[in-house]
Interface confidence: medium
């Protein structure tokens, strides 16, 4: 009869490498009597016999991981026991070993040039796989710009044109190599005005060609804005070459305007647009507007608050440090003077002064002011208000006018635009053309001028009736 | 140095009656737009009221129209805010500001330390 | 009624840009809003940084600027200082009917 024996495992376990989905096997033989009861762990916990992802054969002295997962390395025991003395234990390591696998693959990218982009490369892999980019056919350099970040992931700092292209990412370990699809970096560029269109200073009824160039990925659409509004007349061709847009607008000039070249192009749901405007002045009447600069706004005074029209842009002149305030205080001040004057020229001096001082205003790259029309500062001057204008020219050339509406530079009526020329190129007072049609008698005028020159305003129409717009009063 | 110092803040029931004044100085009072703002405990800014510098016009927020007037007097460099049918969502701290220039809605550019009006029964 | 509006809150790190913006519930931002910039910090008045869309208020360091962006009123701060933690307010003038000034729900500005 034999003797009892305690377990010895004679053949201690060892460090098994396997890679994943293959066959990984531990041996833990045993030399004992009676036959030993050998129980497995795995990071101590037990391994269930009836655990089908395993096979224990050979009385237990054998272990099987039949289909090994990233999840399954770890320290592995076999524990063996026969009630003759202690249990005893052999432990060895499963060491999984992964062929690289990219798990996160790049994706097309479109970016704006000059932003940053990143291009993702997660990969797996024991041992740890290395990444590396491919650009085109060749291996991508890293610089101060272009990085590969720990995570595999390709970051390209201020994109620039020249970094479009098709990109793969290779991941690589001792086991093999992985490569990505290819994808494509697309790099899209603001739209940008490459050549602006050029002011012109020429005769009435002249015909001007206005060009604007454009450059931008996509290749940017072009616009044009007459005076903040559509074109309304003209001719517009266009070509294309190389992602560079020329545009040319040709225009039969009757008046001056502000010409904007609007260039456009598409990012995703955003738009990018670059600006450039000319004006086109006609000779006759532009030294008096071509020195004026400042900006258009909305009139938020009080002084005019009831003779401008409400939501209108007004012209601001800069050649003051705070064009609205000085603007309000001179108006302010001719307001006063105008508290002397008759009730019949009050109202139409004070619609002239405020509509001369706060001109309204086309808006764009050059804000440009629109001038009182020439038959309205004529009628406000010999007809509304002859008797106190006389007596202001009088007293300003003896040089005793010293406020109100001498500091104020009243318009020259003479150097104005006629609305019988354009309508549309000069301001017209509203008040007038509701107030001619309720005066039965002006008072008679003592004028150097032939009567041809008093003006002939216009009979009202419904855009110059009484409107909530305008103070009649 | 600019200052505007208000008063006449505290506690009253709704539908009391309160005025704030603005003692200004430190600048030519009579050659600026001036403004109240509030702001209620926790909350943003809101505009109140304003005035230009020769108070001929006023403006209002909505849902102060017909219950609040502001008022200045050049000659004693104070702006007021008088304050009737109070409501509870008038809780708040009333700054008083003066604006950049003449014109009523000029940029705030000096503020008060606010005073604190209550309406709580 | 149209509402001023501005980003709830943001952050920055010491030294880096951020760009707040004001911006209009229908409708653009323009010059003739006039923008004005407003800073405040807890149990303070107001201070004025930006008026009338982009001019400094005296005394503001120039690390403060304004413009319109697209269809906003934005106030860049470069170069962000842990004291630059604060609320920041826009106001707008508006006009639709009446004269209004109108100021936006606030940011809260943290430099971490």
């Known amino acids: 009869e034999k003797l009892p024996k305690a377990p010895v495992i004679t053949t201690p376990l060892e460090t098994v490498d396997a890679l994943v989905e293959e066959v990984a096997t531990f041996m833990c033989a045993v030399e004992s009597y009676p036959q030993p009861e050998i129980s497995w762990t795995r990071n101590k916990i037990l391994i269930k016999l009836f655990d089908t992802r395993y096979s224990i054969r050979e009385n237990g002295q054998l272990l099987t991981i039949l289909s090994v997962e990233d999840s399954d390395d770890g320290i592995y025991c076999c524990i063996a026991n026969n009630g003759v003395g202690g249990a005893v234990e052999s432990c060895g390591a499963l060491q999984v070993k992964m062929k690289p696998k990219i798990t996160r693959p790049p994706i097309n990218v479109k970016i704006i040039e000059g932003l940053k982009a990143v291009l993702p490369c997660t990969t797996m892999g024991n041992p740890k796989p290395s990444v590396s980019w491919i650009k085109g056919d060749n291996a991508l350099r890293e610089n101060s710009r272009i990085a590969v970040l720990e995570s595999g992931s390709l970051r390209i700092h201020n994109v620039q044109k020249e970094d479009a292209g098709q990109y793969r990412c290779v991941a690589k370990n001792s086991l093999g190599t992985a490569y990505s699809k290819l994808v494509k970096l697309e790099v899209e560029v603001f739209a940008r005005i490459l050549r602006a269109p050029e002011s012109h200073n020429v005769t009435f009824g002249s015909f001007v060609t206005l060009r604007c160039t454009a450059i931008g990925i996509p290749v940017p659409t072009i616009s044009w804005i007459e005076n903040g509004n559509a074109v309304s007349s003209g001719s517009i061709q266009e070509s294309v070459k190389d992602r560079v847009i020329d545009s040319r607008l040709q225009l039969f000039i009757t008046k001056p305007g502000l010409y904007t070249c609007i260039a456009t192009n598409k990012h995703g749901e955003k738009f990018s647009t670059a600006k450039a405007a000319a004006t086109v002045s006609i000779a006759e009447w532009s030294k008096s507007q071509k020195d004026s600069q400042g900006y258009c706004a909305q009139y938020r005074g009080e002084v005019c608050d009831a003779v401008l029209a409400k939501d209108a842009l007004v012209f601001f002149n800069t050649s003051y440090r705070d064009p609205e305030d000085a603007q309000e205080l001179l108006i302010h001040t001719a307001w006063n003077e105008l508290k002397a004057v008759s009730p019949l020229c009050r109202p139409a001096a004070e619609a002239l002064l405020c509509n001369h001082l706060f001109q309204e205003c086309s808006p764009g790259v050059v804000p440009t002011p629109m001038p009182i029309c020439r038959e309205y500062c004529l009628a406000v001057k010999e007809l509304f208000c002859a008797k106190e204008w006389q007596a202001m020219e009088g007293k300003a050339h003896r040089g005793l006018y010293r406020s109100g509406m001498h500091l104020l530079p009243v318009p020259e009526c003479s150097k104005l635009p006629s609305m019988h020329r354009d309508p549309t190129a000069c301001t017209r007072l509203p008040y007038l053309d509701y107030k001619k049609e309720n005066i039965t008698t002006f008072p008679s005028i003592t004028s150097s001028r032939p009567s041809a020159d008093i003006p002939n305003l216009p009979a009202s129409t419904s855009s110059f009736a009484v409107s909530p717009a305008y103070s009649m009063t | 140095e600019v200052q505007l110092l208000e008063s006449g803040g505290g506690l009253v029931q709704p539908g009391g009656s309160l005025r704030l004044s603005c003692a200004a100085s430190?600048?030519?009072?009579?050659?600026?737009?001036m403004s109240w703002v509030r702001q209620a405990p926790g909350k943003g800014l809101e505009w109140v009221s304003a005035?230009?510098?020769?108070?001929?016009?006023?403006y209002y927020k909505e849902s102060v129209k017909g219950r609040f007037t502001i008022s200045r007097d050049n000659s004693k460099n104070t702006l007021y805010l008088q304050m009737n049918s109070l409501r509870a969502e008038d809780t708040a701290v009333y700054y008083c500001?003066?604006?950049?220039?003449?014109?009523?809605?000029?940029?705030?550019?000096?503020w008060g330390q606010g005073t604190l009006v209550t309406v709580s029964s | 009624q149209t509402v001023v509006t501005q980003e709830p809150s943001f952050s920055v790190s010491p030294g880096g840009t951020v760009t707040l913006t004001c911006g209009l519930s229908?409708?653009?931002?323009?010059?003739?809003?006039?923008p004005d910039w407003y800073q405040q910090t807890p149990g303070q008045a107001p201070r004025t940084l930006i008026y009338?869309?982009?001019s400094r208020h005296s005394g503001v360091p120039d690390r403060f600027s304004g413009s319109i962006l697209g269809n906003k009123a934005a106030l860049t701060i470069t170069g962000a200082q842990a004291d630059d933690e604060s609320d920041y307010y826009c106001?707008?003038?508006?006009?639709?009917?009446?004269?209004?000034?109108?100021f936006g729900g606030g940011t809260k500005l943290t430099v971490l």
């Open positions: 009338s869309t982009d």
């Open positions: 106001g707008l003038y508006m006009y639709s009917g009446s004269k209004n000034y109108v």
């Open positions: 229908s409708g653009s931002v323009t010059s003739s809003n006039y």
């Open positions: 430190g600048f030519t009072f009579s050659d600026y737009g």
């Open positions: 005035i230009p510098w020769q108070g001929g016009s006023t």
């Open positions: 500001a003066k604006r950049s220039g003449r014109i009523a809605f000029g940029a705030l550019d000096a």
